[in-house]
Interface confidence: medium
């Protein structure tokens, strides 16, 4: 069980401090930008962070948002990450979700976050580079200190 | 300018019942999960209930499980906490405030307190 | 859930610095980086003075700051001025029934 807590507005990015943002065609992708980059960029690089509580406490429960022209919302349905046009619901009535990832930070660096799947134990978001494109993927967090599955959350509220 | 007004305190009698109210103005109220801190006199600060922005996701303290309800009417920009079965223990400044978990860079806000005096 | 726990009172000289601790557990400070850290002078509301560990909010001076290690996070104020005397409390998520607590609380005199 998720219950929903509360929602926060953030600037996601990786450890090459490309910024997270939402293309044209809904893919999650990392680009360099500068903050007026950002800024200008916006919504597309605005995600809302909705915390939820955890029936089963396994760490901060998270869906994560973006509001475009509607709100979608990332899934890692059959372990693939993309955007679905949906609200994170108040409640979810079952211990896995494919919207919801546990948020914690990387023993040892308390401002670098790391988010695991509810729905497969042991894989992580991370950024992966195919061909010229920084992507969001799922990931199976295969060895210690993977730096591509870690990221730096920063509140814009 | 952000504020938050509580009202609905006062004298109650053990046992009695008593609905506190917090009216909001200066944000997009529904924006924003809410929450009920109180304090005792010359106490410390007690985290009493929490709501989501759309109201389905409630909490409670342990303390209060089971005889407070807490709601929200976004059409009013108003935060409400039913309080029941009420203790002396439950006598407090009660405070409403946003946001509750994260905090925020741009602050959080209090509203100014009402005071809820449980006795006979 | 007990409150976190907290030095009953701590005081220094203005320009001197002072560091509040807040002990928890792994299931709240140690687990989870919501903690917050707030000011609350006699007959006022909190105050938010920092958030998520080591976050200012805007406004708040940067004598302020903010750390964690392990299950205990603490405040440090430097350069002590008069107006800082008031009571300091921190505050967590916890994954207990409860959800949010804070600290027992500790008065700060500036002599």
């Known amino acids: 069980y998720f219950g929903k807590l509360e929602s926060k507005l953030s600037i996601i990015r990786n450890l090459n401090d490309q910024v997270l943002f939402i293309d044209q065609g809904n893919r999650p992708l990392f680009e360099d930008m500068t903050d007026s980059d950002c800024r200008d960029n916006a919504p597309r690089t605005i995600f809302i962070i909705n915390m939820y509580k955890d029936s089963q406490p396994r760490g901060m429960a998270v869906a994560i948002s973006v509001k475009c022209e509607k709100i979608s919302t990332l899934s890692c349905e059959n372990r693939i990450i993309s955007f679905k046009e949906m609200n994170p619901p108040d409640n979810i009535k079952d211990t896995k979700s494919d919207i919801i990832f546990f948020q914690r930070s990387v023993p040892g660096h308390d401002n670098k976050m790391q988010f695991e799947s509810s729905s497969y134990e042991g894989y992580f978001l991370a950024c992966e580079k195919e061909r010229d494109l920084y992507k969001l993927i799922l990931k199976k967090k295969d060895e210690l200190g993977d730096r591509s599955i870690m990221f730096t959350v920063q509140n814009e509220d | 300018e952000v504020q938050l007004v509580e009202s609905g305190g006062g004298l109650v009698q053990p046992g009695g019942s008593m609905r506190l109210s917090c009216t909001a103005s200066?944000?997009?109220?529904?924006?924003?999960?809410m929450s009920w801190v109180r304090q005792a006199p010359g106490k410390g600060l007690e985290w009493v209930s929490g709501i989501s922005t759309g109201g389905g996701g409630t909490y409670y303290a342990d303390s209060v499980e089971g005889r407070f309800t807490i709601s929200r009417d976004n059409s009013k920009n108003t935060l409400y906490l039913q309080m029941n079965s009420l203790r002396a223990e439950d006598t407090a400044v009660y405070y409403c405030?946003?946001?509750?978990?994260?905090?925020?860079?741009?602050?959080?806000?209090w509203g100014q307190g009402t005071l809820v005096t449980v006795s006979s | 859930q007990s409150a976190l726990t907290q030095p009953a009172s701590v005081s220094g000289s203005p320009g001197q610095s002072i560091t509040i601790s807040c002990t928890g557990t792994s299931s709240d400070v140690g687990g989870y980086n919501y903690v917050s850290w707030y000011q609350q002078h006699p007959g006022k509301a909190p105050k938010l003075l920092i958030y998520e560990v080591s976050h200012r909010p805007s406004g708040v001076s940067d004598r302020f700051s903010g750390s964690k290690s392990g299950n205990t996070a603490s405040l440090t104020i430097s350069g002590l001025q008069a107006e800082d005397e008031a009571d300091y409390y921190c505050?967590?998520?916890?994954?207990?029934?409860?959800?949010?607590?804070f600290g027992t609380g500790t008065k700060l005199t500036v002599l």
């Open positions: 200066g944000f997009t109220f529904d924006e924003y999960a």
């Open positions: 405030a946003k946001p509750w978990l994260s905090g925020s860079r741009s602050g959080d806000f």
């Open positions: 505050s967590s998520f916890t994954s207990s029934s409860s959800l949010y607590v």
